[in-house]
């Protein structure tokens, strides 16, 4: 019979012969022959192969370097790579996410417009007139000034973007 020019799915052509690929989680030790099947071996600890393959070496699991603010989100298996994520309170510095950086806080006078995620930093906005923030925070929005009127009080000290208004009693000595 004519030697094959193409092989079925999960096979590969070698020496004019179709050999079975190794299944995910295993690497190739030796090609098949006319008389023997393809020989495969499981990947070692901390190694993986995620496809049907003819690789002679497994890939090393990704290292989630705590030095770069990374931690393990999902431990790798013989068939899957480790998935890294940023430490709590940190976010990726780029799409590649090879390192992370601490979320920023919004300074007094600024409030959180958008809370940081694993891939984006905190977005701050200046507190507009009528609002204030007196803390440095990665979570707190600008708070509205206290309404003295609703408490039957008057403004004794005006508020700023960093301080609330100070309310005081109404002046009862009016003529």
């Amino acid at each position: 019979p004519e030697p094959p020019t193409a092989c079925r799915e999960k096979q590969y052509l070698i020496n004019s012969q179709c050999c079975s690929l190794c299944q995910p989680g295993q690497k190739l030790v030796s090609d098949c022959t006319e008389f023997t099947e393809t020989e495969c071996l499981p990947c070692g600890e901390s190694e993986f192969l995620d496809t049907w393959n003819r690789e002679t070496h497994c890939h090393q699991h990704k290292y989630c370097d705590p030095n770069l603010g990374l931690r393990v989100q999902q431990k790798g298996t013989s068939e899957t790579d480790t998935i890294c994520t940023c430490e709590e309170g940190w976010h990726c510095t780029s799409e590649a996410c090879e390192s992370c950086v601490l979320h920023r806080s919004c300074s007094p006078g600024f409030g959180v417009k958008q809370i940081a995620t694993g891939v984006s930093d905190t977005i701050c906005e200046p507190c507009p007139v009528g609002f204030f923030s007196n803390v440095s925070s990665a979570f707190e929005k600008c708070h509205p000034w206290t309404s003295c009127e609703t408490k039957d009080l008057v403004v004794q000290q005006a508020g700023t973007n960093k301080t609330d208004v100070v309310c005081g009693p109404q002046d009862r000595l009016r003529a």
């Epitope: 030095n67 799409e95 806080s105």
Partner: antibody, heavy 115, light 107 residues
Framework: EFQLQQSGPELVKPGASVKMSCKAS????????IQWVKKQPGQGLEWIGY????????NYNEKFKGKATLTSDKSSSTAYMELSSLTSEDSAIYFC????????WGQGTTLTVSS | DIVMTQSHKFMSTSVGDRVSITCKAS??????VAWYQQKPGQSPKLLIY???TRHTGVPDRFTGSGSGTDFTLTISNVQSEDLADYFC?????????FGAGTKLELK
């Protein structure tokens, strides 16, 4: 091998500005932040801020806002720090370092402000 | 800003001794603390991060411990090449802040 190569020493007059550089090699420049740290003789270290070369986002220590400006150039894998309105208090060694936890540091740029 | 206080500006030791350098944070920083060694004319060198993790290539005579507000860098079996300045740093919140440093010198 990862390396951060900083520009040479600077002697400048009070009131002037200076721009120092930090050239990165041996890694993908845009995947890691570059932070800057000030060291005055006989004193501790002071964190100035960082730049993320991927997004050009900066984060400054309030104390250095208006004093330091951080920029970067992806094409040359170089981070820059410009210091303005210089006084004798700005005389120090300035270090650039990769990552928030300073894994790799430049050799430092000595700035002397003197008339 | 979080203040990192290194109570000893200088510490005297002898080769072979065990020495502990302390650092106190003005508020809880969890374990977000690093220790650096700096020798004259050199840039700082990372020794410990996340309070107790030894950086690659750092000899195991350097040990970090602590969490919250109290942190310690211990050098067991001090060698002459360990004579240097040691700085703690918090990276729990911005701005990152350093201790004033502890200079390790020979008795």
């Amino acid at each position: 091998e990862f390396q951060l190569q900083q520009s040479g020493p600077e002697l400048v007059k009070p009131g002037a500005s200076v721009k120092m550089s930090c050239k990165a090699s041996g890694y993908t420049f845009t995947n890691y932040i570059i932070q800057w740290v000030k060291k005055q003789p006989g004193q501790g270290l002071e964190w100035i801020g960082y730049i993320n070369p991927y997004s050009s986002e900066t984060n400054y220590n309030e104390k250095f806002k208006g004093k330091a400006t951080l920029t970067s150039d992806k094409s040359s894998s170089t981070a820059y720090m410009e210091l303005s309105s210089l006084t004798s208090e700005d005389s120090a060694i300035y270090f650039c370092a990769r990552d928030l936890i300073g894994n790799y540091w430049g050799q430092g740029t000595t700035l002397t402000v003197s008339s | 800003d979080i203040v990192m206080t290194q109570s000893h500006k200088f510490m005297s030791t002898s080769v072979g001794d065990r020495v502990s350098i302390t650092c106190k944070a003005s508020q809880d920083v969890g374990t977000a603390v690093a220790w650096y060694q700096q020798k004259p004319g050199q840039s700082p060198k990372l020794l410990i991060y996340w309070a107790s993790t030894r950086h690659t290539g750092v000899p195991d005579r350097f040990t970090g411990s602590g969490s919250g507000t109290d942190f310690t860098l211990t050098i067991s079996n001090v060698q002459s090449e360990d004579l240097a300045d040691y700085f703690c740093q918090q990276y729990s919140s911005y701005p990152l802040t350093f201790g004033a440093g502890t200079k390790l010198e020979l008795k």
